[in-house]
């Protein structure tokens, strides 16, 4: 039961995290105009990964896409790449994890296969979360660098007469959404990996062997189940150890208590 809960919770947490990563990537407020210690302006500037926007106090908002690829800073391109890789990995991870969920039964899929899929999706979620956190952190570092550079020459004087307002940018809402979302995806991935350990069948399955008087043809099945002779019923035969492995027939006929929530 704990394994199913851990797996289910990991899936839900990762789902929320990936939704957050997608939201952060699409958001326009990656960097916002710094209002502190700045001349009070009748416009509010903010920028995303894909476009920059200006909200005028009069109520009009105007956004312009970055229609160039080559003209954009390499760091911005890197952030875009990290976020997209994070989304793609996360989406694939979600797809894999749906089939890996213990509460969902698909044909005659063995627990070992589900365990492997859970581990795969968990790793994908971890990498996805790390990509998002890295992307957001790179952008934040870029902002901090630019902030202090623009602070150093906030007013560029022209002959000491004319002042030009230098717009400084600070952290936007998308950065915090990205950090939290990346963290959630990472946590979800770790939970999936933990759940995988509980799903995996034990390796040490002892083989049950029946000993009989010579002359009989002895047959046994590995895995600790019904070893039988060529003659009728065998009363001596005992099930030594059940490591959780079952035949296909038994999986279909006798679902375990963990198969339904």
């Amino acid at each position: 039961m704990a394994v199913t809960a851990c797996q289910g919770l990991g899936f839900v947490v990762s789902l929320i995290g990936i939704a957050g990563i997608i939201a952060a990537t699409c958001m326009d407020q990656w960097s916002t105009q710094d209002l502190y210690n700045n001349p009070v302006t009748a416009v509010f500037n903010y920028q995303g990964l894909w476009r920059s926007c200006v909200r005028e106090s009069s109520g009009f908002t105007e956004c312009r896409g970055y229609f160039t690829l080559l003209g954009l800073p390499a760091m911005l391109q890197a952030v875009r790449a990290l976020m997209i890789v994070g989304i793609v990995l996360g989406a694939i991870g979600l797809l894999v994890s749906i089939f890996a969920l213990k509460c969902i039964r698909i044909g005659s899929m063995e627990d070992s296969a589900k365990a492997n899929m859970t581990l795969t999706s968990g790793i994908m979620f971890i990498v996805s979360g790390l990509c998002a956190i890295a992307g957001v952190s790179v952008f934040a570092n870029m902002l901090v660098t630019n902030f202090w550079m623009s602070t150093a020459n906030m007013y560029t004087g022209m002959g000491g007469m004319v002042q030009t307002v230098q717009t400084r940018y600070t952290f936007g809402a998308a950065l915090f959404v990205g950090w939290v979302a990346g963290g959630l995806t990472l946590i979800g991935g770790v939970m999936m990996c933990i759940a995988c350990r509980g799903l995996a069948p034990e390796e040490t399955n002892y083989k049950a062997v029946s000993y009989h008087a010579s002359g009989h043809s002895v047959a046994y099945k590995p895995g600790g189940f019904k070893a039988s002779t060529g003659f009728g019923s065998n009363t001596k035969n005992k099930k030594i150890y059940d490591g959780g492995a079952r035949t296909e027939d038994e999986v279909q006929s006798y679902p375990s208590k963990h198969d339904y929530v």
Epitope: P39, T41, A42, V54, G59, V165, Q166
Partner: antibody, heavy 117, light 113 residues
């Protein structure tokens, strides 16, 4: 058609308060702002302040201590209140609607205010 | 506060003449976020409220004749009337629409020669 109309007292005694109402039509005060501008007789335009759609206000630094702008969105009215009037506050007071690039695209006809004892 | 300096303070012209008036601001009115200049030009005739002619330094308001042209960027702006008509005789004001307080220039009075 967007319209703005100012209504004021006309004559106010020095040291008293001036209250002017601007009634707007054909646009929402929850979306758009209203600016106040005055013009002393024979002089230029002076921007006083603005109340934006979200309710935030900005005032001219020289008048910040005695000027307040408020609004009643349900009645489509904006109010200007200027305290401690002096004779140099005598002017025609206009309300105007800021549009694209914050430029004032619609103006009221103005209301003339004389500060005199 | 931003100081808006208009020159000349008055202009005497004949009908059909080309007129240019200047407006300088003490700070740049160019917003880096959208590379737009936040400067407006108004025309005021006696006994009337001001009328918006140009916004964003160069965009003509709807209904304004195309003989009115706004130009300039940053701190230096110009209003040009390509061929002055009798109805253009008025006072022209420029206004900073970027940094509070949204100050006006002192105006340029256009008179008939």
């Amino acid at each position: 058609q967007v319209q703005l109309k100012e209504s004021g007292p006309g004559l106010v005694a020095p040291s008293q308060s001036l209250s002017i109402t601007c009634t707007v039509s054909e646009f929402s005060l929850t979306t758009y702002g209203v600016s106040w501008v005055r013009q002393p007789p024979g002089k230029g335009l002076e921007w006083l302040g603005v109340i934006w759609g979200d309710g935030s206000t900005n005032y001219h630094s020289a008048l910040i201590s005695r000027l307040s702008i408020s609004k009643d969105t349900s009645k489509s009215q904006v109010f200007l209140k200027l305290n401690s009037l002096q004779t140099d506050d005598t002017a025609t007071y206009y309300c105007a609607k800021p549009g694209l690039r914050n430029a004032m695209d619609y103006w009221g006809q103005g209301t003339s205010v004389t500060v005199s004892s | 506060d931003i100081v808006m300096t208009q020159s000349p303070s008055s202009l005497s012209v004949s009908a059909g003449e080309k007129v240019t008036m200047s407006c300088k601001s003490s700070q740049s009115l160019l917003n880096s976020g959208n590379q737009k200049n936040y400067l407006a030009w108004y025309q005021q005739k006696p006994g009337q409220p001001p009328k918006l002619l140009i916004y964003g330094a160069s965009t003509r308001e709807s209904g304004v004749p195309d003989r009115f042209t706004g130009s300039g960027s940053g701190t230096d702006f110009t209003l040009t009337i390509s061929s002055v008509q009798a109805e253009d005789l008025a006072v022209y004001y420029c206004q900073n629409d970027l940094i509070y307080p949204l100050t006006f220039g002192a105006g340029t009075k256009l008179e008939l020669k």
